[in-house]
Every structure is written in structure tokens, then in C-alpha cells.
């Protein structure tokens, strides 16, 4: 886990102050408003998760 001001999070993750850890950019599909998703902006946007088929 990354502490603020140290080495960046690993590829595919971004620092979350809310969670106090590196968080997976993949989760921005389901929770696009998460605080760390701005740091994931380099990744192409994915469609939002369907609740039901």
C-alpha cells in the first residue's frame, strides 16, 4: 500500500484518501465517482455495470 508522498500506486490502481490505500481503477466502472477515479483517467472509460440483464 502507498502512503501519500511516497512511490505511486501500481499500474491499474490509484491513491484513495477515502480508503487510505491504493484502489483498483477497475472498480471505477461500478463507482465512477470514487475519489481515486480521477487518477485513473488515463484508462479508457468502461460502460457502467448493468444492474440486471
Amino acid at each position: 500500500e502507498q502512503a501519500p508522498g511516497t512511490a505511486p500506486c501500481s499500474r491499474g490502481s490509484s491513491w484513495s484518501a477515502d480508503l487510505d490505500k491504493c484502489a483498483d481503477c477497475a472498480s471505477c466502472r461500478a463507482r465512477p465517482h470514487s475519489d481515486f477515479c480521477l487518477g485513473c483517467a488515463a484508462a479508457p472509460p468502461a460502460p457502467f455495470r448493468l444492474l440486471w440483464p
Epitope: 477515502d18 480508503l19 472498480s27 468502461a46 455495470r49 448493468l50 440486471w52 440483464p53
Partner: antibody, heavy 119, light 111 residues
Amino acid sequence: EVKLGESGGGLVQPGGSMKLSCVASGFPFTKYWMNWVRQSPEKGLEWVAEIRLKSDNYATHYAESAKGRFTISRDDSRSSVYLQMNNLRAEDTAIYYCSPTYADTMDYWGQGTSVTVSS
Amino acid sequence: DIVLTQSPASLAVSLGQRATISCKASQSVSTSTYSYMQWYQQRPGQSPKLLIKYASKLDSGVPARFSGSGSGTDFTLNIHPVEEEDTATYYCQHSWELPYTFGGGTRLEIK
């Protein structure tokens, strides 16, 4: 250290009711969706219900098998999640686990509480 | 609902060898960037534990002996070299949409 403690299981007759509780600690509870998942030899692992956050107006989602009979709720002030189960059937017999998920992964699991529906 | 089919249902692998478990989804659970597939380990008498998320990312504290791969509908969990403590049942789970579903499990025995 993350801790999840389920309770409230036991033996209940068909058609009866039961309320399960889960107390959580060691992670930012108010930021996590909470799930109930059950496990039986017949059906394996089966997702039951999910409750989201205050900012989502505590939106709830249920498996088809739980709709109309089960109600999930949470109390953020107590870092707790509940599952009210009504009109219980023999096929609801299982170990019930609570599990937090930020979005996709069931990051932690409690020890489970056993529910037996039998006459 | 998305159906996840695991194979084999059980396998026995010699200590130090490779265990390979397959999970096939009834529809794609991947975008061009990520795959929404997880793997869990459940040791006898214990609760499930997250091993791998998003098809290939190890959860914190999981040994590098475990690896996951795949996209679309076909996913694989590999364990190499297997150790005694890997005796467990392994489950895949998707998070593409609700309802979340799990595979039927693969029981791994170490010879």
C-alpha cells in the same frame, strides 16, 4: 485488522422468521457496500443481497430467491448490517456470511452463522 | 444470470507440481481494459478468502505461487508450485452485473 461477526442463526420452522446481524470493524464501513452470501452443500456459494451507501439512498438488491422474503439493512453508526428473513423454506438452510465489497470483490468474510429450516 | 462453470470438479496434484483450474462464463465479463472475475480459496472448515481480483491481480498477502489469467468468457487459476496448505476448494465469481454468481467450486487435493 478486519473483523466481521455474524450472529442470529439457529433452527427455525418452515414459514418462520429470523434476523441475522453482522458487526464489522477494521475498515471504513460507510464507504463499503455490504453483502450477504450463503453456502449450502446443494447450491454452493450463492449471493443473497447487497446494500449500498447513504449517498446511494441505501439502495438494495436481491437475488431472485430472496426477493419479497428477505430485507437487508444497515446501521452505519453501529457498523452493522442485518438480514431479516421471513417465510423461510427448507432450501434457505445454509451458512450465511456477510462480506463488504467496495465494488467488485468480496474482500473479507466473517465466520458465518448457520441457519437450519426444518420442522 | 451469468452461469460460471468450473472444471475439473476436483483434482489431485503432487506437491511442487502445477494445479490448473478453469472457469467459463456464459457471457463475456470483460471490457477492453478489465475483466470482472475473481477467485476465492476456501480451506476446509474455514470461510472463503479473496485470492485474485479482476482476473489476474493478486490480493494483498497472496503468495506469488498463485496466478490468474483470461478474458472474455474463459479464465484460469494456476497454482505452482502447490504446497500442502493449498488443499482447499477454489471458486470463481463474476461482478459484471447483478446478480453476482459463483462457480460450483474445484476441490484441490495435494498428493
